[in-house]
């Protein structure tokens, strides 16, 4: 049975040209985390595998950095980076947990971080 919950950084905003950290945290489960995927829509950005460590998709290598922790850092942001990002925790025996983050990249310097929120 899937008992865990994912806490994410929620809805966030950042300045064009800047960087942002995407963070998720899985709690309330004793399941083993075997891999965490970071995806934008249906595009794989990066993988953090329990055995292999980090793998960044070649098309994002210049602008994506692993960490901190299981998080992901997006750099040199453009307005085109605005959209939904997903952390997918692959666990055993529970299965797949998904967290959602919405990032808005702003032209101005008034970007503020949104509140954290829970996904059941």
């Amino acid at each position: 049975m899937m008992t865990g919950t994912i806490e994410t950084t929620g809805n966030i905003s950042a300045e064009k040209g800047g960087s942002i950290i995407l963070q998720c945290h899985l709690s309330s489960t004793t399941a083993q985390v075997t891999q965490v995927n970071w995806e934008q829509q249906d595009q794989l950005l990066a993988i953090c595998n329990a055995d292999l460590g980090w793998h960044i998709s070649p098309s994002f290598k210049d602008r994506v950095a692993p960490g901190p922790g299981l998080g992901l850092t997006l750099q040199s942001l453009t307005v085109n980076d605005t959209g939904e990002y997903f952390c997918i925790y692959h666990t055993y025996p529970d299965g797949t947990y998904t967290g959602r983050i919405f990032l808005e990249v702003l032209e101005s310097s008034v970007a503020e971080h949104g509140a954290r929120f829970q996904i059941p």
Partner: antibody, heavy 119, light 107 residues
Framework: EVQVVESGGGLVKPGGSLRLSCAAS????????MSWVRQAPEQRLEWVAE????????FYADTVKGRFTISRDNAKNTLYLQMNSLRAEDTAVYYC????????????WGQGTTVTVSS | DVQITQSPSSVSASVGETITINCRAS??????LAWYQQKPGKAPKLLIY???RLQSGVPSRFSGSGSGTDFTLTISSLQPEDFATYYC?????????FGGGTKLEIK
């Protein structure tokens, strides 16, 4: 070209043991998690076991837990399934399959090896 | 375990037609369903995963849709090589479970 080839199947008596092998080629074996899936005659496919890329995580279906052991030798590009205390209901075609890098499905399968448990 | 009910168990169609195959999960599996094609004596071949993602090299006449508990595989403009058995599989939680299969036959 990605290839996985199973071997080691055969006829065995109930309570007996068998070791299946799966030789992989055409990809970096040590990067991929691997699974065994079986199909009994006239039955649906059944996931049996999985092992992580480095071998540190192993997972089993309840029907085989405690009897089957999945392992791998990355230096030899080979996956194994040690099957002990075999039962008639373990009779099936056993497939070795590669898990996708993003962990979502099984993207390359072998042709299968047949295991028959009968007295 | 998540039970997967696949329908129909067999379907007859002609080259050029469009057919659909359905899978229903006993509880929500989000978008995490894969579709495979298998021909007699051959290894299963991955067609679609995560509900609608087309596996590399698979023709675009194959498409998947659905989320939650109900999913559909559509094959448009059937080709002679498409006549085979199709299986769905949930990859949302362990143990991964499969549908009973749909045999696609030439009418």
């Amino acid at each position: 070209e990605v290839q996985v080839v199973e071997s080691g199947g055969g006829l065995v008596k109930p309570g007996g043991s068998l070791r299946l092998s799966c030789a992989a080629s055409g990809f970096t074996f040590s990067t991929y998690a691997m699974s065994w899936v079986r199909q009994a005659p006239e039955q649906r496919l059944e996931w049996v076991a999985e092992i992580s890329s480095g071998g540190s995580h192993t997972f089993y279906a309840d029907t085989v837990k405690g009897r089957f052991t999945i392992s791998r030798d990355n230096a030899k590009n080979t996956l194994y399934l040690q099957m002990n205390s075999l039962r008639a209901e373990d009779t099936a075609v056993y497939y070795c399959a590669r898990k996708t890098l993003d962990y979502y499905a099984l993207d390359y399968w072998g042709q299968g090896t047949t295991v028959t448990v009968s007295s | 375990d998540v039970q997967i009910t696949q329908s129909p168990s067999s379907v007859s169609a002609s080259v050029g037609e469009t057919i659909t195959i359905n899978c229903r999960a006993s509880k929500s599996i989000s978008k995490y369903l894969a579709w495979y094609q298998q021909k007699p004596g051959k290894a299963p071949k991955l067609l679609i995963y995560s509900g609608s993602r087309l596996q590399s090299g698979v023709p675009s006449r194959f498409s998947g849709s659905g989320s939650g508990t109900d999913f559909t595989l559509t094959i448009s403009s059937l080709q002679p090589e498409d006549f085979a058995t199709y299986y769905c599989q949930q990859h949302n939680e362990y143990p991964w479970t499969f549908g009973g299969g749909t045999k696609l036959e030439i009418k």
